[in-house]
Interface confidence: low
């Protein structure tokens, strides 16, 4: 979680002098409660926007917007605290709108916006706007919260953001998998324009089960420049296990911009004559996780073999 470094955020508007300050997420009014506090924000809206940094990088940002209730409590409104909590890490970042003048009228509905919180692809956040000062311990809450889910890098606009491009979002491997005779799978995919190696992660399952019955990892060395954008063909030998017939093939690149945290692409071969819709493998995984879930091998003698070549 971080703040956009450019342009400087602005909260002042006609009829209000205001400045944006970094916050520790612990406003003084928590420690020293006030007798009279403002009412809560109204109509909190969170939207996905995109913003360029000074260096020209494009990032997804949370566009936060809310209005004030049309009551007399604006006379006691000293500002607002905006808090963004990343749900999977419990990381929190806050900023404070500090009002330098008093609000004295409702000639028009007061509306506030802030678009400087940089968010990550495929992450969920809780956005909270607290009006300041915060209420006394038993007072009515004067905040509003909303959850905000950022799309993953498959989303059309997200795909061209810097974090997604850094993780390899522009690479489309166009994976094809076909079953050959003698317990073999032929995997074909398009190489990217970088001399980096790839891993193919094969996970096989019985029909209608999510416990794996076979796994194999196959390493593909870095292609030469003349092989960029060419198809690479790999033949994987499967374990001859009755019923171990549904195969998930995941290709993990190791691009220089993302190394062991690049976006993965996957394809599935269903069991013959029994159409099946398996759980998809998450595409956004760290190096050490071929897939989520617990391991439950049906066969301990796990010796797959494979060979590959680049096709011109």
């Amino acid at each position: 979680l971080r703040l956009l470094d450019f342009p400087a955020p602005v909260c002042a508007q006609e009829g209000l002098s205001c400045r944006v300050k970094n916050s520790t997420c612990l406003d003084d009014s928590w420690i020293h409660p006030r007798n009279l506090t403002p009412s809560s924000p109204k109509d909190l809206q969170i939207q996905l926007h995109f913003a360029h940094t000074q260096q020209g990088d494009l990032f997804p940002v949370a566009h936060i917007e809310w209005t004030l209730q049309t009551d007399a409590s604006i006379l006691y409104l000293e500002g607002a605290e905006l808090s963004v909590l990343q749900l999977n890490t419990n990381e929190r970042l806050c900023v404070r709108f500090e009002f330098l003048s008093k609000l004295r009228h409702h000639h028009r509905r007061w509306r506030f916006t802030f678009s400087h919180f940089v968010v990550d692809p495929d992450q969920e956040y809780e956005v909270t706007v607290h009006h300041l000062p915060k209420p006394i311990p038993d007072g009515d809450p004067n905040h509003q919260s909303k959850n905000f889910l950022v799309p993953d890098c498959e989303h059309a606009r997200m795909k061209v953001t810097t974090p997604c491009m850094s993780s390899g979002s522009l690479w489309d491997p166009n994976i094809t998998v076909e079953t050959l005779e003698a317990h073999q799978l032929r995997v074909s995919f398009t190489l990217w324009n970088e001399s980096t190696h790839y891993q193919i992660l094969l996970t096989s399952f019985p029909h209608m089960e999510n416990h794996s019955c076979f796994e194999h990892m196959h390493h593909i060395p870095a292609p030469r420049p003349e092989e960029f954008h060419q198809r690479s063909n790999v033949t994987l030998t499967l374990r001859n296990l009755k019923g171990c017939c549904r195969h998930q093939v995941q290709i993990q690149p190791f691009f220089s911009s993302c190394l062991n945290d690049c976006l993965r692409h996957s394809a599935t071969v269903s069991c013959p004559e029994m159409p099946d819709t398996p759980e998809p493998i998450p595409d956004y995984m760290p190096l050490w996780e071929p897939r989520s879930g617990s391991s439950d091998y049906k066969d301990d003698d796990d010796k797959g073999s494979s060979h590959h070549h680049h096709h011109h």
């Epitope: 990343q86 999977n88 890490t89 990381e91 990550d120 692809p121 495929d122 992450q123 974090p163 993780s167 891993q199 796994e215 194999h216 990892m217 390493h219 190791f254 911009s257 993302c258 190394l259 062991n260 945290d261 956004y284 995984m285 760290p286 190096l287 050490w288 996780e289 071929p290 897939r291 989520s292 879930g293 617990s294 391991s295 439950d296 091998y297 066969d299 301990d300 003698d301 796990d302 797959g304």
Partner: antibody, heavy 118, light 107 residues
Framework: EVQLVESGGGLVQPGGSLRLSCAAS????????MNWVRQAPGKGLEWVSF????????YYADSVKGRFTISRDNAKNSLYLQMNSLRDEDTAVYYC???????????WGQGTTVTVSS | DIQMTQSPSSLSASVGDRVTITCRAS??????LAWYQQKPGKFPELLIY???TLQSGVPSRFSGSGSGTDFTLTISSLQPEDVATYYC?????????FGPGTKVDIK
């Protein structure tokens, strides 16, 4: 030179808290997943926690789940381990370690010692 | 969770001897296994990854083999500087468990 330097260890009472830091240098920290591993005095290695490069995936050992929080700040090239509700059995040298592309952990810090005692 | 066991827990051998350490996973882990060497008072060092791939800079007397549940670390000719504790570690999925270690010293 690729380097990891841990800090923040010390003596703390049972039930107390500590925050460990790991400063990374010499490599593109924001592209790497990271781990915390610990070693109790005279004992073996115990994996503690994992965080992926963009914090999108996090794992904990059962022994620390609900008490420890791993986080990172890629802008500061730093990895953190917030340790709450510390117990005697958390006494150990804590290492941060970088996973190698292809598997295993190829870069380790020198470790920071955490002692939980009343 | 998958358990990792190592045997023996300790061994003494002479300089030049061939030393073999085994690591067993309670369930198959394909070739998602690493071996580490830790000398007294030092941090661990990666020797082998992907069960059999030698880490850059590691002497060729070290080798790894195995797949599925049974893995072996072999030191073809034990040297005095090989006195250390050796650990295996699985990394197919969390938790990334280490074996209990094998302490190797010179007779």
């Amino acid at each position: 030179e690729v380097q990891l330097v841990e800090s923040g260890g010390g003596l703390v009472q049972p039930g107390g808290s500590l925050r460990l830091s790991c400063a990374a240098s010499g490599f593109t920290f924001s592209s790497y997943s990271m781990n915390w591993v610990r070693q109790a005095p005279g004992k073996g290695l115990e994996w503690v926690s994992f965080i992926s490069a963009r914090s999108s995936t996090i794992y904990y050992a059962d022994s620390v789940k609900g008490r420890f929080t791993i986080s990172r700040d890629n802008a500061k090239n730093s990895l953190y381990l917030q340790m709450n509700s510390l117990r005697d059995e958390d006494t150990a040298v804590y290492y941060c370690a970088r996973p190698k592309v292809g598997g295993g952990m190829d870069v380790w810090g020198q470790g920071t010692t955490v002692t939980v005692s009343s | 969770d998958i358990q990792m066991t190592q045997s023996p827990s300790s061994l003494s051998a002479s300089v030049g001897d061939r030393v073999t350490i085994t690591c067993r996973a309670s369930q198959g882990i394909s070739n998602y296994l690493a071996w580490y060497q830790q000398k007294p008072g030092k941090f661990p060092e990666l020797l082998i990854y992907a069960a059999s791939t030698l880490q850059s800079g590691v002497p060729s007397r070290f080798s790894g083999s195995g797949s599925g549940t049974d893995f072996t670390l072999t030191i073809s000719s034990l040297q005095p500087e090989d006195v250390a504790t050796y650990y295996c570690q699985k990394y197919n999925r969390a938790p990334f468990t280490f074996g209990p270690g094998t302490k190797v010293d010179i007779k």
